[in-house]
């Protein structure tokens, strides 16, 4: 009788489809992830199963709490799609598909500087390029640890460019750039490049 009641409940909103989610949607290879399969019904003892494409990854029982499946994303095929099944006795429902985006982390970018010196000004062109890492890559330029450019998105493996004009400075300035893609909390920085304070021979980046 209980099985019949559960199946009837599944035809109503009492037993909707489970929800499959992860706090991390963008990952890099080798990263450990946790997947959460949860259900709105907190009173039923539910058996949760996790699938990737057409393989079964594991089964857990739960009541009131989401089932947590811990995985390591080491191969491209492990991006998904995943789906979760919630089962009560002989009745079951499936979640929507969930897929991770696998992103290669950016490598440290290289900053190049080109300067055109006039009597009063320096026209500076900054180039920044990270040769590895999934596109798009966002580049930001810094002067003395302060951002001087907006994030510049590059969808190809070409350097980001930023131009600025400065009065001939009285002190030396340090430039660097940051490269970041969709991987959260993962940014890399170029080595700093220092511009000397005075003109003449002490402007190694200047076009004569």
């Amino acid at each position: 009788r209980k099985a019949v009641l559960d199946c009837e409940a599944m035809k109503t909103n009492e037993f909707p489809s489970p929800c499959l989610d992860s706090k991390t949607k963008v990952v890099m290879k080798g990263q450990n992830v946790s997947m959460f399969c949860s259900h709105k019904n907190k009173s039923l003892q539910i058996t949760y199963s996790l699938f990737r494409r057409k393989t079964h990854l594991g089964t857990q029982d739960g009541k009131g709490e989401p089932a947590i499946f811990n995985l390591s994303i080491t191969e491209a095929h492990e991006s998904g799609p995943y789906k979760c099944k919630a089962q009560v006795t002989s009745c079951s429902k499936y979640s929507r598909d969930f897929s991770f985006t696998i992103v290669d982390p950016v490598t440290s970018p290289v900053l190049n500087i080109m300067v055109i010196q006039t009597e009063t000004d320096r026209h500076i062109t900054l180039h920044c390029l990270s040769v590895n890492g999934s596109l798009p890559i966002n580049y930001t330029f810094f002067e003395n640890h302060v951002a001087i450019s907006p994030a510049i998105s590059k969808y190809d493996r070409e350097p980001a460019e930023f131009n600025l004009t400065k009065k001939n400075p009285g002190e030396e300035e340090e430039y660097r750039c940051e490269a970041k893609n969709r991987l959260p909390n993962y940014a890399t920085y170029s080595h700093p490049v220092t511009m000397p304070s005075t003109g003449g021979d002490s402007c190694p980046f200047c076009l004569k």
């Epitope: 699938f51 990737r52 494409r53 057409k54 393989t55 079964h56 990854l57 594991g58 099944k85």
Partner: antibody
Framework: EVQLVESGGGLVQPGGSLRLSCAAS????????ITWVRQAPGKCLEWIGT???????YYSTWAKGRFTISRDNSKNTVYLQMNSLRAEDTAVYYC?????????????WGQGTLVTVSS | AIQMTQSPSSLSARVGDRVTITCQSS????????LSWYQQKPGKAPKLLIY???RLASGVPSRFSGSGSGTQFTLTISSLQPEDFATYYC????????????FGCGTKVTVL
């Protein structure tokens, strides 16, 4: 070259045990699923059980308890341990590999090994 | 237990004929399409023809096709060739009572 080679078949008495091996080459068992299938003389194909890339095992109802699938990643080999053998277990035993993340799309098969259960 | 009923159990046909084999499952396969078809010749291991109910495996001639969903599936050979005389099996994957697979009992295609 991707291939599977079964071994360990032969003549065994009723009630006896036998361990079959399935040696994989050209791919890693940590990525692919291996399934054991048998075929009695002149009969249908019969699913015995499966071990997936995570080491999870699954068995047909009739095989559960008597048959055990395991693997040794260092040898890239899967085993089928068969206990309490009966005359009706006489068959050619195949191991087969599934597609990545598709346990039962069996695209690579071994040549089979014959198990005869007789007194 | 899950039953995979294959029909007919045998059939005779001529080269050039269109041949249809069906598999009826007692329960829906996983994802409604977890079904594959195999060809087996005497003394040989089976060969994968169709997966995902309708997708052609690598290297399989286009005269083979699959269709169906849920519990009812069909393998069609549009124009039978001499090398197609063999036994054909379906294999379904299930998650209703554990993660489970079941073969149909085969259809033997012989020369008329």
């Amino acid at each position: 070259e991707v291939q599977l080679v079964e071994s360990g078949g032969g003549l065994v008495q009723p009630g006896g045990s036998l361990r079959l091996s399935c040696a994989a080459s050209g791919f890693s068992l940590t990525i692919y699923t291996i399934t054991w299938v048998r075929q009695a003389p002149g009969k249908c194909l019969e699913w015995i059980g499966t071990i997936n890339s995570y080491g999870n095992t699954y068995y047909s109802t009739w095989a559960k308890g008597r048959f055990t699938i395991s693997r040794d990643n260092s040898k890239n080999t899967v085993y089928l341990q068969m206990n309490s053998l009966r005359a009706e277990d006489t068959a050619v035993y195949y191991c087969a590999r599934g597609y990545v993340d598709s346990d039962w799309y069996l695209n690579i098969w071994g040549q089979g090994t014959l198990v005869t259960v007789s007194s | 237990a899950i039953q995979m009923t294959q029909s007919p159990s045998s059939l005779s046909a001529r080269v050039g004929d269109r041949v249809t084999i069906t598999c009826q499952s007692s329960e829906s396969v996983y994802d409604n399409n977890y079904l594959s078809w195999y060809q087996q010749k005497p003394g040989k291991a089976p060969k994968l023809l169709i997966y995902d109910a309708s997708r052609l495996a690598s290297g399989v001639p286009s005269r083979f096709s699959g269709s169906g969903s849920g519990t009812q599936f069909t393998l069609t050979i549009s124009s039978l060739q001499p090398e197609d005389f063999a036994t054909y099996y379906c294999l379904g994957g299930y998650d209703s009572s554990g993660w489970y697979a079941a073969f149909g009992c085969g259809t033997k295609v012989t020369v008329l």
